[in-house]
């Protein structure tokens, strides 16, 4: 594809402070949102007929730490294939050499919205416990390909007004590093959990808590544990959670577990309070038992010690979830990672440019010769859950339809998806 | 056991240009990056340039940007770093160094450069 | 770029002291921080990489922490073969740089 790529087939066009310049057969490019990695555009794709999301990658190998993300991306991008996880569609660079080589583009799936929006609606319990399910769907699918991942948040996570949701990006690399006591970065951290927050060993039921975190915004219409920093994110948990058993301070190392046994002792505050009746959907007597059963899988969500958490195929089996249990779609083969060493890798930026350029080289190589499918596929998994055409669930219809595929978007060109404050 | 052997390094005139070789053995050459370091007399050490396993990839220090060119020949197990336009202040021992991950694993005994009128 | 600062830069210790020499990035390179050690017309030598994984071949009295930007390497019970410059150097973002050094000296 290098040899014969031609600048005839690209253009340029200003977005925000970038130059997007991209293959024509992708018009019509609007800013949709900016994250840590670059901008993200809506755009129609010729080619298909459809709106797709065009996200650059602009000089992803400037430094470690946007390198490994850049390339675990695009490799995870290439292997997963699941209804819930956002679909890659095209990976083309416009430069022709590696010695040229500075920007990627990522061509992905466009949705309506991400949670951030919806969180600001009031859901029913069929459309609440629906999105939840295809989250664990997601989430378990991710994990059984190996990947934990650690930084579910309501900006990575996307939504079409029919209900259907999908799981924007692959987290945190097992690798990236997670200190206590370290300078606290402009990321969104109220979705971590302790066990990260606080430097400890992890397992997949890591990502529960996110989702617990995200039940509970929906629930409340407001972040649940809104931390300042990873210290003041530690104590909004215990103040209303309560401080943790001696048992749990025994997992920590000495220095996190000084600092934690010499703060104040909460009590912990109860789930009936925490999330009272009147803040969820209550229009039926049906609903009162949805009501009770939401509440039971927060409170078996939220919970600070990880050994006393529930697992991901436990909440997909809770009664709030398991309405919706398709075994096409929450036991989906592993997707099969092709790079063994994709979490451990560890290079110069030199060799980083390089590992990411042969990966959108094989792309293009395979997309040229075929092998990529040339029309967005429904993901490897057909859908027997979805609810019927009946089902008021199959529309959002209040959601704002401003596209949007803006991964890691703390800083969104859309007002929209911007910080949340006050509860509703 | 790996080995970097540099040579090339001499006595040059400002304005002046010299090739360094830096002949490896000891490990598969073409695997990783390598790089250039260089230390003034009496000074720190400075990193120059860098260069993929391949040779697709090359990076510079701002200070010899435009002016030295690394490449290697994975045939020949060889590192080179070609130096135009030279300066009093490119005097330095030149160093070999060999990438492994994201640090420099193991350097060469080095070559002098002295650019002087 | 990424500016390097060590501390301090030079310092008298005898045999047996434990000594720290300190090193700070101008912005956060996560753990990708390397130390050397010189001595006098000799190549550097990888003590510690990754800010805190000992090189193979290295005495164990060698250690190295932090996270973020700053950083520090620690000789547990100083040797006389431990008498030399000491660098640190950041491998998070191109151009990769070196502390000024730090001179390690008998006291």
């Known amino acids: 594809m290098s040899d014969s790529k031609c600048d005839s087939q690209f253009y340029s066009v200003q977005v925000a402070d970038s130059t997007f310049t991209v293959l024509k057969r992708y018009q019509q490019l609007k800013p949709i949102g900016s994250g840590a990695q670059g901008i993200v555009c809506a755009a129609f794709d010729t080619v298909l007929g459809i709106n797709v999301a065009v996200k650059k990658l602009s000089r992803p190998f400037q430094n470690q730490t946007h390198a490994k993300r850049a390339y675990r991306e695009l490799v995870l991008l290439k292997c997963v294939n699941h209804k819930n996880i956002i679909s890659l569609l095209n990976v083309f660079t416009p430069q022709k050499t590696l010695e040229e080589f500075q920007d990627v583009y990522l061509v992905m799936e466009l949705m309506d919205a991400n949670l951030c929006q919806v969180i600001h609606m009031e859901l029913d319990h069929e459309r609440m416990s629906y999105l939840l399910y295809q989250m664990l769907c997601g989430i378990k699918h991710l994990h059984s390909a190996g990947i934990i991942h650690r930084d579910l948040k309501p900006s990575n996570i996307v939504v079409k007004s029919d209900c259907t949701l999908k799981i924007l990006d692959f987290g945190l690399a097992r690798t990236a590093c997670t200190n206590f006591m370290m300078t606290p970065y402009v990321v969104t951290r109220y979705y971590r959990a302790p066990e990260v927050i606080l430097g400890m060993g992890y397992k997949e039921n890591v990502d529960i808590w996110s989702v617990g975190c995200i039940m509970g915004e929906l629930v409340k219409g407001c972040v649940i544990f809104q931390g300042t920093d990873h210290i003041d994110q530690w104590n909004k948990v215990i103040e209303q959670l309560g401080t943790p058993s001696a048992e749990f301070m025994k997992k920590l190392q000495p220095t996190v577990r000084n600092y934690v046994e010499n703060r104040p002792k909460y009590p912990g505050i109860k789930f009936e309070e925490l999330f009272p009746d009147w803040i969820f959907p209550s229009e039926s007597e049906r609903d009162k038992i949805k009501t009770s059963q939401a509440r039971d899988l927060l409170s078996k969500m939220l919970v600070i010690d990880p050994d006393k958490r529930i697992s991901v195929d436990e909440a997909l089996r809770h009664p709030y979830i398991t309405v919706w249990y398709d075994p096409a779609e929450a036991e989906a083969p592993p997707p099969q990672i092709y790079d063994a060493q994709l979490e451990e890798r560890e290079h110069a930026i030199e060799e980083w440019k390089e590992l990411i350029y042969k990966e959108v080289m094989d792309w293009e190589e395979r997309s040229k010769n075929g092998v990529v499918k040339d029309q967005p596929s429904d993901a490897a998994v057909s859908s027997n859950a979805t609810p019927s055409q009946s089902s008021s669930i199959n529309d959002i219809s209040s959601m704002s339809t401003e596209q949007t595929l803006a991964s890691d978007t703390d800083s969104s060109l859309d007002a929209s998806t911007g910080p949340l404050e006050g509860c509703r | 056991e790996v080995q970097l052997l540099e040579s090339g390094g001499g006595l040059v005139q400002p304005g002046g240009s010299l090739r360094l070789s830096c002949a490896a053995s000891?490990?598969?050459?073409?695997?990783?990056?390598m790089s250039w370091v260089r230390q003034a007399p009496g000074k720190g050490l400075e990193w120059v340039s860098a260069i993929s396993g391949s040779g697709g990839s090359t990076y510079y220090a701002d200070s010899v940007k435009g002016r030295f060119t690394i490449s290697r020949d994975n045939s020949k197990n060889t590192l080179y770093l070609q130096m135009n336009s030279l300066r009093a202040e490119d005097t330095a021992v030149y160093y070999c160094a060999r990438g492994h991950g994201s640090n420099i694993d193991y350097w060469g005994q080095g070559t002098l450069v002295t650019v002087s009128s | 770029d990424i500016q390097m600062t060590q501390s301090p830069s030079s310092l008298s210790a005898s045999v047996g002291d434990r000594v720290t020499i300190t090193c700070r990035a101008s912005q956060s390179i996560s753990s990708y921080l390397n130390w050397y050690q010189q001595k006098p017309g000799k190549a550097p030598k990888l003590l510690i990489y990754?800010?805190?994984s000992l090189q193979s071949g290295v005495p164990s009295r060698f250690s190295g922490s932090g996270s973020g930007t700053d950083f520090t390497l620690t000789i547990s019970s100083l040797q006389p073969e431990d008498f030399a410059t000491y660098y640190c150097?950041?491998?998070?973002?191109?151009?990769?740089?070196f502390g000024q050094g730090t001179k390690l000296e008998i006291k």
């Open positions: 150097q950041q491998s998070y973002s191109t151009p990769y740089t």
């Open positions: 990754a800010a805190s």
């Open positions: 000891g490990f598969t050459f073409s695997y990783g990056s």
